[in-house]
């Protein structure tokens, strides 16, 4: 299953498949997540040893049990790959490193005013992978706003040195954020020149384009069919790139194929799997193991279950069966792709599910009519659970926000459907940042059923939480994709980085918001909070959080939207915008519904609603 | 230049049997995944069956399961269908086509046999 | 097995009309989707395939787009030869199922 959990002063012994520099545990553990062959990884920052070379060493394990002793080493972060964890599963880091700078080949320099347009520019740069920003206060003159496009071999920089004012960070296209725009036409008969960078086996060009579009130096690829004329070269995907970014040249091939890496179209990438089956062909590599299932599909999820299982065959041959059940024949290989393709066989193949990112249909755990004012606008994917609830009688208009939890289930605010409990009035619109970009072609979630917590009870402050079950489930993609939910009663985690989300009033009498605002507030014990609400009963089951002086909080429209933080690298929905007294005054805390008190009600309702479980838990 | 052509079809009463023939020229027919696809007087197109390059491995839609058997001689670049307890609803138009090899696409089509399945 | 349902069934549409067909798959298929086009007494023609790739020959007025469970395909100015009916086809798997047809006609 899914292993979120990271440990600290912990350094995982043997086992090394790969290592590279990587700017924090984090990225470490995403590169792991991508890599074949890694499951578990140890990362060493620059404050947890003195050896230079080591400094920001992120190293990349296997194990064929899962597991590998662990050391004490202070200062090193140890963990799991991603690999099975759904929605977690993204090549998307957005993180800026302050004092760091990020070594590779520099192939562009050029004067920018702010890390975020350098950041901006590497995105729009077919060839940066990552890049480095000089601030106004360099200690050396020249170099001051100077914005360094970078790339490598492997993708990660080939070294990471602490340097005072400078900022680094990596290409947001993995994000879907890039403005260059894809080609997505796949060329028969047409084979690309240029540099190969990889050369792996597949069953179609499909699966060539999609690890093209993941690999950290591919640019466009060529295929060589099943029907190529050099046997030694069938079902061979070249992974390809070039100094211009395109090829420079074409020939036509017949039985070849050639396209484009994705990594660049803006608002989707493909998943960084492979779903299809494919029936006749036989997928050759190393040994994992040999179980007898009934039915192809059994199979693919017996290799999805099986964390080490790259790919699989399963075979039709009669002394391979046994009753209903035959030979699934669980295999993997150094590079993830088969090491030999055979068509025509008796039997049918396809790849572990591991790396999908649509993840199961569950919501994921682990172990007011209150805008934000203060706030800043957000970007595209920085939010991607937060959801404008919408009421269409007359004129449509946004009412509350609420949180993506799973395919089918959105948490909000019980206040946001007082006097308003009819199910067909609403529209929930989920993957946008500008309410404006809503037309009458956008499409949008119906609601199923409105389930208001049994205890709440209008105009009280209490038990202020409601469950949407969809119409419909959707589909998560970079910026429509859930929120994780706190533990059941979590109160040992302390939180120091939690932001408010919505489309609510910037100010006490204003109006909704076209971009999705954002604001970082601390939160505030019960205690201190109870202090200033002296009228009202503060209880175990509500959270605060907003600045001493005010100035910052959430407001009208923001209700029923996400207060979230941010711990060990992962988000959690802490609470839901529910009530405060007016809006960022001073010494008057925003109120929020605590989730981690309402895990089994969550539960009880999430499964109930399906007759089976709905909650996964990553740790 | 490729080109398939379908022969075989004609008049056959319900329950008798039928073997369609597609003469493949232009190509290396040994390497290739071949289809049938037919298609009802005034309706749609649906896929039938496939066959891979060896022969060694076939599929068919659920219509046709156990009726009818796909077959090539690769010697003689020829592609089969055989059909038996045939049905009024067998009647169609049936086209011989090449798949696309690594797009998963029929790039190449017969110009049909017509198969009536009449007393 | 996928079902592929196409819409409309049929329209009718004048020569330089821009012409939008969808085609909506019962369960995600990604990009294994091709586009055919057909007239009276002719076998079915490959116009596109892998969801927006134009097949050799066909000309650049005929676009596809989509993945997943949604696709489209576009003429952008319609020709007196596009008069025709035109079928989606998923190749995901198998019965390799079609569409049931959407029949362009001359307004």
């Known amino acids: 299953g899914c292993l979120t959990q990271l440990y600290e002063n912990a350094f995982f012994r043997g086992g090394d498949v790969a290592s590279m520099y990587t700017p924090n545990a984090q990225y470490c553990q995403m590169r792991c997540t991508f890599h074949p062959r890694c499951l578990l990884f140890s990362f060493l920052p620059a404050s947890s040893i003195n050896d230079m070379e080591k400094r920001f060493g992120c190293f990349l394990k296997d194990s064929v049990t899962g597991t590998l002793p662990k050391v004490h080493r202070t200062g090193a972060v140890s963990g799991h790959s991603l690999k099975q964890c759904g929605h977690q599963i993204s090549a998307c880091h957005r993180d800026i490193y302050k004092g760091v700078d990020m070594r590779g080949v520099n192939f562009n320099v050029s004067k920018v005013s702010s890390v975020e347009e350098c950041q901006k520019r590497c995105t729009s740069n077919i060839r940066c992978q990552f890049f480095s920003y000089a601030t106004q206060t360099f200690h050396k003159a020249e170099y001051r706003n100077n914005c360094l496009l970078k790339y490598s071999p492997g993708g990660t920089p080939t070294a990471i040195k602490v340097l005072s004012n400078v900022e680094s960070g990596f290409s947001l296209k993995p994000c879907a954020l890039s403005e260059i725009g894809c080609h997505m036409n796949i060329f028969q008969h047409l084979a690309f020149s240029d540099v190969d960078v990889a050369r792996v086996l597949t069953p179609d060009a499909f699966v060539c384009r999609t690890i093209c579009t993941y690999h950290p130096n591919c640019l466009f690829f060529t295929f060589y069919t099943n029907v190529w004329k050099i046997e030694s070269q069938r079902n061979v995907c070249l992974l390809k790139t070039s100094e211009s970014g395109t090829p420079s040249s074409s020939t036509p091939q017949e039985n070849t194929i050639s396209g484009y890496s994705l990594l660049t179209c803006k608002r989707t990438l493909p998943e960084p799997c492979h779903s299809k089956i494919y029936p006749g062909v036989d997928f050759g590599g190393e040994e994992l193991n040999v179980t007898f299932v009934k039915g192809v599909n059994v199979c693919q999820e017996t290799c999805t279950k099986m964390i080490r299982c790259q790919f699989f065959t399963y075979s039709l041959l009669p002394e391979d069966c046994k009753e209903e059940k035959c030979k699934c024949f669980l295999r993997l290989s150094m590079d993830g792709s088969p090491t030999r393709i055979a068509y025509g066989t008796q039997g049918s193949s396809g790849y572990s599910l591991r790396l999908c990112n649509t993840g199961d249909n569950s919501v994921c755990t682990t172990k007011t009519s209150t805008r934000i004012v203060g706030g800043t606008n957000s970007s595209w994917g920085e939010w991607p659970w937060q959801v404008s609830l919408q009421v269409k009688l007359t004129a449509q208009r946004h009412l509350c926000g609420g949180s993506l939890i799973g395919h089918q289930w959105v948490l909000t605010a019980a206040h946001c459907f007082d006097g308003l409990p009819l199910q067909d009035v609403w529209r929930i619109y989920s993957g946008i940042l500008n309410l404006s970009d809503i037309t009458k072609d956008t499409p949008f979630s119906q609601i199923k059923e409105i389930i208001i917590h049994q205890n709440y009870k209008v105009s009280e402050g209490n038990h202020d939480i409601a469950l949407i079950k969809l119409q419909a489930p959707l589909n998560y993609t970079e910026f429509q994709k859930p929120i994780c939910l706190p533990s059941k009663g979590d109160t040992s985690t302390i939180y120091t980085n939690c932001w408010v989300t919505g489309w609510g009033f910037s100010k006490e009498k204003g109006e909704i918001q076209n971009i999705l605002q954002k604001v970082n507030i601390p939160l505030v014990t019960n205690e201190e909070c109870q202090k200033r609400y002296q009228d009202y009963k503060i209880t175990q089951r509500m959270v605060c959080a907003g600045y001493k002086e005010g100035g910052k909080d959430a407001c009208k429209g923001d209700s029923g939207g996400p207060l979230v933080c941010k711990h060990n690298g992962m988000w959690r929905l802490v609470g839901i915008t529910s009530w405060g007294e007016g809006c960022a005054r001073r010494e008057q805390p925003g109120v929020y519904t605590k989730v981690a008190e309402y895990m089994d009600w969550i539960l009880e309702k999430t499964q109930s609603s399906d007759g089976k479980a709905q909650m996964q838990s990553p740790a | 230049e490729v080109q398939l052509l379908e022969s075989g079809g004609g008049l056959v009463q319900p329950g008798g049997s039928l073997r369609l023939s597609c003469a493949a020229s232009?190509?290396?027919?040994?390497?290739?995944?071949m289809h049938w696809v037919r298609q009802a007087p005034g309706k749609g197109l649906e896929w039938v069956s496939w066959?891979?390059?060896?022969?060694?491995?076939?599929e068919y839609a659920d219509s046709v399961k156990g009726r009818f058997t796909i077959s090539r001689d690769n010697s003689k670049n020829t592609l089969y269908l055989q059909m038996n307890s045939l049905r009024a609803e067998d009647t169609a138009v049936y086209y011989c086509?090449?798949?696309?090899?690594?797009?998963?696409?029929?790039?190449?089509w017969g110009q049909g046999t017509l198969v009536t399945v009449s007393s | 097995d996928i079902q592929m349902t196409q819409s409309p069934s049929s329209l009718s549409a004048s020569v330089r009309d821009r012409v939008t067909i969808t085609c909506r798959a019962s369960?995600?298929?990604?990009?294994?989707l091709n586009w055919y086009q057909q007239k009276p007494g002719e076998a079915p023609k490959l116009l596109v395939f892998?969801?927006?790739s134009l097949q050799s020959g066909v000309p650049s007025r005929f676009s596809g787009s989509g993945s997943g469970t949604d696709f489209t395909l576009s003429i952008s100015s319609l020709q007196p030869e596009d008069f025709a009916t035109y079928y989606c086809?998923?190749?995901?798997?198998?019965?390799?199922?079609f569409g049931q047809g959407a029949k362009v006609e001359i307004k």
């Open positions: 232009g190509f290396t027919f040994s390497g290739y995944i």
């Open positions: 086809q998923q190749s995901y798997s198998t019965p390799h199922t």
């Open positions: 066959i891979y390059p060896s022969g060694g491995w076939t």
């Open positions: 369960q995600s298929i990604s990009t294994y």
């Open positions: 086509a090449r798949d696309a090899p690594g797009v998963g696409a029929i790039d190449y």
């Open positions: 892998a969801a927006s």
